[in-house]
């Protein structure tokens, strides 16, 4: 009933909670001298299902018949009309349709950790869009049976909240949940489970790394456990690893030796329990506990490169340059790189520590054979050193590579071709390929690059510190045993014209002849490497087209000799720079006027 | 002090229902586990029927179906609804209580600490 219903009453039959598919009988009765005011044969009772008229009739009681209601709840209404009057509210009714509740499904129940509590869950089934009450039910040994009953509208989840205990851990539990609504019951199939079965450990906490003499090889991984557990997985990675690495061990008592991480590196551990070898299931992975292995001495060498300069007639520059070892090979922090320097004849030795630098440049006399031993040392010592002999890499021109070509590889790449020397190609015992920025200068303290290459190998993709746009002067030298030959070009992985031409600064002349001498265009306005310069005159104020000379581009050269200008005649002069790509615009315009006689 | 004072024993025909009360003082019934123990003459205690803290009932299954335990949270009491009596119910009924939170631990006397001094129920053919 919905209000107080004093004019008259609602019956619903056969019930207020009916199946989906059911027909109601809903009765609509006026209590006695409760219809309209003068003339009982003229009420008329409305039903209104929500607010749209269903049905009415003339007299003290309607009865309609309604079927096809949809699941949920349908509020019927009856009201009453009287002649010049607005309908009065009777009484109400609501009905409730529904079905019966499916067998609960894949019953299963938990206990996180050995004082965690028995929880259960379930599948429902379909909405019963009923009040539908779920019961959960214990079966366990010596006669007893725990139950608790479900509050929730929607239930699929009951934690007893107490705890099952070890004291018999094979003993037998049964589980069964039961729905029950209006309309009729049901109850799941029985889970029947052992302590053992349900009780999911807690993760393994206090994890721990031991480290016996600061050893990689001595290390023990140390955690505490709940009481029970029998069995645990150990995991563990480098943390900059997707993989992980997995270790099953049996009666652990929270500790195990682990014997093949690498040397100074960071690793993620975790741990995991069970109770039983073959029953229940692992405990959650613990927290994750980060700690980074000791260092051990570095393995591997140095790949040591170097250059010769000549100074003067007693003196040669040496740079030495070296590649830093790989992670995996320092196996350790860097400290400090030795390099040692010995006159091999006279056996005179100078060693140096470097620290932040992976080059070195000393000057030696030109006399004598000189070696250089480059190592990497860390905290716990130091890698093998590499030697060298300090030789004249290009001195051998029978060892120099052939036909060299540098062509660009898509972005920033840059293939570089050879053929192998005139002399014995099999006598080649490696090559290597290096490359820096074109300085016009020569600059010393451009940085250096290199690459090693098998000696049957005829070609090398360079990639390290390729630059857009930057022209850079490649060699390949062919080495064979304590002779070395090279060859030499320049190459870009992109060009496009220069942005700028040459700056003429000066125009002297000689002998009925000028020198034009001109300022190198700035490196980063090359735009990769130069060809060709081209120098342009023409008489002032004509309107002729420019002569013009072509000069093949060289790196140290900035001035060049015409000598086809008439004499007492004023010139115009400029210049322009060349890549594949294009020619640059204008330098500097620069007028002229040779003085010498006329032929 | 804590104390639980029981009512409602007395004499029934078998068939017949009773209702036990159990009333607390001194602690608060919703935080404890209530139980039900009984002891017929002769007989050791034994255990009736319990409800933990967290509203989970255990009962021996001789009276599943026919005892219900419940509690009032508002009246710090809890309530031993009998139906269908049989002789072999008679006994003195006992109202226990202790801070209880395994399963086993329900159906154990040793497991609670307060105790009524009991009433008794006679149900006779």
């Known amino acids: 009933k919905i209000d107080a219903c004093k004019r008259g009453d609602v019956t619903v039959k056969p019930s207020h909670v009916i199946l989906l598919g059911s027909t109601v009988n809903i009765t609509c009765s006026l209590k006695p001298r409760q219809g309209c005011f003068h003339y009982s044969r003229r009420n008329k009772l409305i039903l209104y299902k929500f607010d749209r008229r269903i049905n009415f009739h003339h007299g003290h009681s309607l009865n309609s018949q309604v079927t096809g209601l949809p699941l949920g709840t349908t509020l019927f209404v009856c009201k009453l009309a009287c002649i010049n009057s607005d309908e009065i509210q009777i009484c109400g009714a609501e009905i409730f349709v529904g079905v019966a509740p499916e067998q609960p499904q894949n019953l299963s129940c938990i206990q996180k950790g050995e004082q965690g509590t028995v929880a259960c869950t379930w599948e429902r089934g379909r909405d019963t869009h009923l009040y539908t009450e779920y019961t959960l039910q214990l079966s366990g040994p010596k006669n007893l049976t725990w139950q608790k009953q479900c509050k929730d509208i929607y239930c699929d989840y009951l934690d007893f909240g107490i705890n099952l205990t070890p004291e018999s851990p094979e003993s037998n539990f049964t589980a069964k949940v039961t729905a029950v609504n209006s309309l009729g019951s049901s109850s799941s199939l029985p889970s029947t489970f052992t302590f053992l079965d349900i009780v999911r450990p807690l993760p393994p906490w206090d994890i721990r790394i031991k480290f016996q003499k600061a050893s990689v090889s001595r290390c023990t991984l140390y955690w505490r456990d709940e009481g029970l557990v029998l069995l645990n997985r150990l995991r563990y990675r480098p943390s900059n690893s997707r993989l992980w690495n997995m270790v099953n061990v049996t009666k652990a008592k929270g500790r195990h030796d682990l014997l093949d991480l690498k040397p100074f590196t960071e690793y993620e551990f975790q741990i995991s329990s069970k109770l039983h070898l073959y029953k229940g299931s692992w405990s959650d992975w613990s927290e994750s506990l980060r700690a980074q292995t000791p260092e051990e001495e570095p393995t591997g060498m140095l790949d040591v490169w170097y250059m010769k300069r000549h100074i003067d007639y007693s003196r040669q520059q040496i740079s030495l340059f070296w590649k830093n070892l790989s992670v995996s090979e320092a196996r350790g922090k860097i400290l400090h790189y030795q390099v040692t320097l010995q006159e091999l004849t006279g056996g005179k030795a100078m060693t140096q520590n470097i620290t932040g630098h992976t080059s070195w440049t000393t000057v030696i006399p030109r006399t004598g054979n000189w070696a250089v031993a480059v190592s990497a040392a860390n905290s716990k010592g130091s890698s093998l050193p590499t030697r060298i002999n300090i030789m004249n890499l290009c001195e051998a021109g029978l060892l120099a590579p052939r036909q060299v070509s540098a062509n660009s590889e898509g972005m920033d790449n840059i293939l570089v071709t050879w053929q192998p020397p005139r002399k014995d190609p099999s006598a080649v015992q490696e090559y290597v390929v290096e490359w820096r920025e074109l300085h016009p200068g020569g600059d010393t303290q451009v940085p250096l690059n290199w690459l090693r290459s098998r000696p049957y190998n005829v070609s090398a993709l360079i990639s390290e510190n390729i630059k857009s746009y930057i022209c850079y002067e490649i060699r390949v030298y062919a080495l064979s045993g304590d002779q070395g030959g090279c060859s030499s070009i320049l190459g870009n992985s992109k060009h496009k014209a220069p942005l700028s031409g040459p700056h003429i600064n000066a125009i002297t002349e000689e002998k009925g002849s000028i020198l034009i001498s001109w300022n190198s265009i700035p490196v980063q306005e090359q735009m990769g490497c130069l060809l060709h310069y081209r120098i342009y005159w023409k008489e002032r104020d004509s309107n002729s087209q420019p002569q013009l000379c072509e000069i093949p581009y060289r790196v140290s050269q900035n001035s060049h000799p015409i000598n086809s200008l008439q004499p007492r005649v004023t010139y115009v002069l400029w210049m322009t720079a060349l890549t594949a790509a294009g020619e640059s615009s204008h330098g500097n315009e620069r007028e002229f006027c040779l003085q010498g006689k006329a032929n | 002090q804590v104390q639980l004072q029981e009512s409602g024993g007395g004499s029934v025909q078998a068939g017949g229902s009773l209702r036990l009360s159990c009333a607390v003082s001194?602690?608060?019934?919703?935080?404890?586990?209530m139980g039900w123990f009984r002891q017929a003459p002769g007989k050791e205690r034994e255990f009736v029927v319990a409800?933990?803290?967290?509203?989970?009932?255990v009962y021996t299954n001789s009276v599943k179906g026919r005892i219900t335990i419940s509690r009032d949270n508002a009246k710090n009491a809890v309530y031993l609804q009998m139906n269908a009596l049989k002789p072999e119910d008679t006994a003195v009924y006992y109202c226990?209580?202790?801070?209880?939170?395994?399963?086993?631990?329900?159906?154990?006397?040793?497991?609670?600490?307060?105790w009524g001094q009991g009433t008794q129920v006679t149900v006779s053919s």
């Open positions: 226990s209580m202790g801070p209880i939170t395994t399963f086993q631990g329900l159906a154990r006397q040793n497991e609670y600490h307060y």
């Open positions: 001194g602690r608060t019934v919703s935080d404890y586990a």
């Open positions: 409800m933990s803290s967290s509203e989970t009932t």
